[in-house]
């Protein structure tokens, strides 16, 4: 039979406070059966930190199931770790026997405790927000230790002052977490804009880490909304056009109304992006003059971002002009160009051209 | 020292049930397959069952799969085989063993228990 | 099941001389490199002792009189120099697939 040998692939585990350490084991035969113990340092002083066969260990798990059939990976994972957990660890194989006698040793993995901090991890707000309303960004680091440690808020690389930040716990402990949430008034040409959290630390060696978050994430820009009329063509046909614009994201629909009836809907897609990062979107509607005998009303009803909807009205004279007219001639223009998302009522907004 | 201590001596009626135990010693109790086997006066050794302790996954000989159930109670360290529908011909020693290796064998055996199914 | 039948199902040796029980699978029962035969010694009124584990590894604190071969659904149990403590029931088992036994071999000085 080949010889059992028991193999410690890393000789060097580096692991951060307060997290957990897996040191690896693998033994190469079933045979001779018995089982795996770990040991930290050598010789009569050293410290037993698992025994498969009996102990309690409430800081060790192995990864394998030990009663997993013909398991040979004997890997332990140390939770919790401290820098009081610092030093080489040993898997060592016994032979089944009264008692078990030592066998075997791997070549040991040395375990370093390190306290750096983990990357910033920003978080925005859970729904989006239009442009001069305040929104708030959360920065979280865990596992550093010293607890001093220096964190700072960029918008467009410009500092921010408006932020609140808490390292905890207050108290000792082998690691800390600091959490800060920046207070960030949004414009209209936040599409683009990015916030980072910047956190700088003694293990970092003046490398500070960043964590950053777009703020594309969470703004709203509503939509601008133009109707107006084309020249009346030949065929007594008028083109009325609506201009949706400045607005993001990008999902929007847009629906026409022919005197309060539904007549087309169209869904905004694969819009070419404005330099702000905003969109613009036209959609027309060819209203047929001479199959009407009264005015028509044309409504463009946009519902942007799952918001409630925007109207603009349009109202079509018949009766002035038959023949062709020019753009706005003898038409009645109703709606607000207000950004808010309140349902905009035609009666409460008449503006006569 | 491992070390496997079944119950006592029973006498039961047929038809009726027995719940044999096993306490567990001089090892984790939750790192090692338990398993059972049974031998009748002048026979062979039966194998019936196996639990592991840690999540009381059990494999049974389907010859024992609809009267016999495992179990366990890691507080003390304990198995259990129940038999149920006892006949005649379930007169038996029955012992607990565990499995060191986790091979499926029997490394380390109570000292059985007897089991007497007799009207 | 894997069915393991063992021969012969007794056995008479004079003490100093070899013993060979034999034990052979209806199906291979190796895998992975190993063969997953056990050999077991059972004396009366005691519960069975492991004696030799995976085919030919021989358990903790059992003499070395005693050795196992084969592999496949062919196994061999030998006892090289009988001695009158060896008296007793062997049995084989299998655990390819979940365990079976022989039906015993009883081993009686000649």
């Known amino acids: 039979e080949e010889e059992l040998q028991v193999i410690q692939p890393e000789k060097s585990v580096s692991v951060a406070a307060g997290e957990s350490a897996t040191l690896n084991c693998t033994a190469t035969s079933l045979i001779p059966v018995g089982p795996i113990q770990w040991f930290r340092g050598v010789g009569p002083g050293r410290e037993l930190i698992y025994s498969q066969k009996e102990g309690h260990f409430p800081r060790v798990t192995p990864v394998s199931d030990p009663t997993k059939r013909n398991n040979m990976d004997f890997s332990i994972r140390i939770s919790n770790i401290t820098p009081a957990d610092a030093g080489t660890y040993y898997c060592v194989k016994f032979r089944k026997g009264s008692p078990d006698v030592e066998l075997k040793s791997g070549a040991g993995t040395e375990l370093s405790v390190r306290a750096k901090p983990s990357a910033p991890v920003v978080s925005g707000p859970a729904v989006r927000a239009t442009a001069e309303h305040t929104v708030s960004f959360t920065c979280e680091s865990h596992g550093f230790s010293p607890r001093d440690i220096t964190l700072k808020w960029f918008k467009n690389g410009n500092e921010l002052s408006d932020f609140q930040t808490n390292v905890d716990p207050a108290g000792k402990s082998v690691s800390y977490s600091i959490r800060s949430t920046a207070r960030v008034v949004l414009t209209r040409r936040d599409v683009h804009s990015q916030v980072i959290c910047e956190v700088a630390h003694v293990t970092l060696q003046g490398d500070p880490l960043r964590g950053t978050a777009n703020l594309s994430e969470a703004i709203r820009v509503p939509p601008f909304l133009e109707v107006t009329q084309q020249s009346m063509r030949a065929d007594n046909q008028v083109n009325v056009t609506c201009q949706v614009t400045k607005f993001y994201p990008q999902r929007l629909q847009l629906t026409w109304l022919e005197n309060g009836n539904v007549s087309r809907t169209e869904m905004a897609s694969a819009l070419p992006e404005n330099k702000d990062g905003t969109y613009n979107w036209t959609s027309w509607l060819l209203v047929n003059v001479s199959a009407h005998r009264d005015d028509v009303k044309l409504t463009c009803q946009v519902e942007h971002d799952g918001q409630p909807a925007v109207n603009k009205s349009f109202s079509v004279k018949v009766s002035a002009h038959p023949k062709e007219q020019g753009s706005n001639t003898a038409a009645e223009n109703t709606g607000t160009n207000e950004r808010d998302y309140k349902d905009d009522d035609d009666k409460h907004h008449h503006h006569h051209h | 020292q491992v070390q496997l201590v079944q119950s006592g001596a029973e006498v039961k009626k047929p038809g009726a049930s027995v719940k044999v135990s096993c306490k567990a010693s001089?090892?984790?109790?939750?790192?090692?397959?338990i398993n059972w086997v049974r031998q009748a006066p002048g026979q062979g050794l039966e194998w019936i069952a196996m639990i592991d302790p840690s999540d009381s996954e059990t494999h049974y000989n389907q010859i024992f799969k609809d009267r016999a159930t495992l179990t366990t109670d890691t507080s003390t360290s304990t198995a259990y085989m129940e038999l149920r529908s006892l006949r005649s011909d379930d007169t038996a020693v029955y012992y607990c063993?565990?499995?060191?290796?986790?091979?499926?064998?029997?490394?380390?055996w109570g000292r059985g228990t007897l089991v007497t199914v007799s009207s | 099941d894997i069915v393991l039948t063992q021969s012969p199902d007794s056995l008479a040796v004079s003490l100093g001389e070899r013993a060979t029980i034999n034990c052979r699978a209806s199906?291979?029962?190796?895998?992975?490199?190993?063969?997953?035969i056990f050999w077991y010694q059972q004396k009366p009124g005691q519960p069975p002792k492991l004696l030799i584990y995976l085919a030919s590894n021989l358990d903790s604190g059992v003499p070395d009189r005693f050795s196992g071969s084969g592999s496949g659904t062919d196994f061999t149990l030998t006892i090289s120099s009988l001695q009158a403590e060896d008296v007793a029931v062997y049995y084989c088992?299998?655990?390819?697939?979940?365990?079976?036994f022989g039906q015993g071999t009883k081993l009686e000085i000649k």
């Open positions: 088992q299998e655990s390819r697939e979940l365990p079976t």
């Open positions: 001089g090892y984790t109790f939750t790192n090692y397959w």
């Open positions: 063993a565990m499995d060191y290796g986790s091979l499926y064998a029997m490394d380390y």
């Open positions: 199906k291979s029962v190796s895998s992975s490199g190993y063969n997953y």
